[in-house]
């Protein structure tokens, strides 16, 4: 036998102007339910049967998945960070091919004084997390690094790494100027060619919420937005209250469809609602027109 | 890692001589080592370095009375300090550069090994 549930329906027209009746479950009664037929073809829009229930894809819901969600997870790294490819010359080590070895005693000693150079240099820059050498060259050395910056995610992330890779520069380009060998003497933990400062490359955390939201809304892409609330971004679509974009539906429901949301307005024993917001209220015993 | 030990430091009349010796746990040959005090309530200062190649430098106040050496074969780094006064009293330390560490005969840049240190005390 089919499924047979106690409900009570309440009318609900589109802002178009069709009524649609929608059922709402006492589930104060016990249901049992016994399904016919095929499964698969129960779940639509690319949901999959467990045994159970239909197990739907973002960005719908519901028993068939035949609804749309209002909001959908979007999940921004808790961290974004940069990577700078600089070069510099140090000037008070001489190169010897153990340098290349990094299991040596010499790339070990090298990498710790250099790494503790970089940290004096860089120490004011919150972004700060550290150096990488990837490279040892002849000229006297010749370092080859990466110097890593990492900040929490918020919208501005970007603006935080730009500024930061620019401190950087200038720092770099500072102890680089300064800290120099005079009449052969280094009076520094390390010296530095001037000329043999280079900014190579620079690589930010590309990531961006608004992408996600359109990639995850899928053919609704066009009506989901992001908006922020504590610095964390919400892909929501008007029908989502609360927010800025939220469609305000007075006495309606909001329903997500291929063109977009719209308002499907109540019908009540003593009124029923139309216009596109369900704002427009006629009383049924006057036929009444109120705002 | 090198560990450095030195000796020879002592109570000592003003005028008179001391020889500090530094002994080093691993080959010293292509590092530059160097002496560094450092009295009660003082700052650190840098009394005397050498480079690989032997070429030395020495801080103002001990030019002329004190001379540093080193030698390889034996991985040992020394400090003669003559005409000893009151003003040296301090705990003397060695120290060794990175390897392959040059431009290094003048005492102000940091040093990545270094001992613990021996006490010279003048005082008549």
């Known amino acids: 036998p089919l499924a047979t549930i106690p409900v009570s329906t309440t009318s609900l027209t589109s802002s178009e102007g069709s009524t649609i009746s929608t059922p709402s479950v006492d589930i104060s009664t016990p249901v049992t339910t016994s399904i016919v037929g095929d499964q698969c073809s129960r779940c639509k829009n690319g949901g999959f049967w467990d045994g159970l229930k239909c197990q739907c894809l973002t960005p719908y819901y519901g028993e068939s998945c035949e609804e749309v969600v209002n909001s959908i997870d979007i999940a921004p790294p808790e961290t974004v960070s940069a990577q700078m490819e600089l070069t510099v010359t140090v000037t008070s080590v001489k190169f010897t091919d153990e340098l290349k070895n990094h299991s040596s005693q010499e790339f070990r000693e090298f990498n710790k004084t250099f790494t503790e150079q970089m940290n004096i240099v860089y120490s004011g820059i919150p972004e700060y997390v550290g150096v990488n050498i990837t490279n040892l060259r002849l000229g006297s050395v010749v370092v080859e690094h990466d110097v890593l910056l990492r900040t929490k995610y918020t919208p501005e992330y970007k603006t935080a790494l730009d500024n930061a890779t620019e401190v950087v520069k200038q720092k770099i380009t500072k102890v680089t100027t300064e800290q120099i060998m005079t009449n052969d003497n280094c009076s520094a933990l390390m010296c530095f060619n001037t000329t043999g400062t280079q900014v190579q490359n620079i690589t930010v955390t590309q990531y961006d919420p608004v992408e996600e939201c359109r990639q995850k809304a899928e053919e609704y892409e066009d009506y989901f937005l992001v908006e922020y609330r504590d610095q964390k971004p919400y892909c929501i679509s008007p029908c989502e209250s609360g927010f800025n974009a939220s469609k305000n539906c007075n006495h309606g429901k909001c329903q997500m469809s291929q063109n977009g949301a719209r308002c499907l307005c109540v019908t009540t024993e003593t009124h029923w609602y139309s216009g596109e917001d369900c704002n427009q209220g006629t009383q049924k015993s006057h036929h009444h027109h109120h705002h | 890692e090198v560990q450095l030990v030195e000796s020879g430091g002592g109570l000592v009349q003003p005028g008179r001589s001391l020889r500090l010796s530094c002994a080093a746990s691993?080959?010293?040959?292509?590092?530059?080592m160097g002496w560094f005090r450092q009295a009660p309530g003082k700052e650190r200062e840098g009394v005397a370095g050498?480079?690989?190649?032997?070429?030395?430098g020495y801080a103002d106040s001990v030019k002329g009375r004190f001379t540093i050496s080193r030698d390889n074969a034996k991985n040992s780094l020394y400090l003669q300090m003559n005409s000893l006064r009151a003003e040296d009293t301090a705990l003397y330390y060695c120290?060794?550069?990175?390897?392959?560490?040059?431009?290094?005969?003048?005492?102000?840049?940091?040093?990545?090994?270094r001992g613990q240190g021996t006490m010279v005390t003048v005082s008549s």
């Open positions: 050498i480079s690989e190649d032997g070429i030395t």
């Open positions: 691993g080959d010293i040959t292509r590092r530059c």
């Open positions: 120290a060794a550069s990175i390897l392959n560490r040059v431009g290094c005969r003048q005492l102000s840049y940091e040093y990545i090994y």
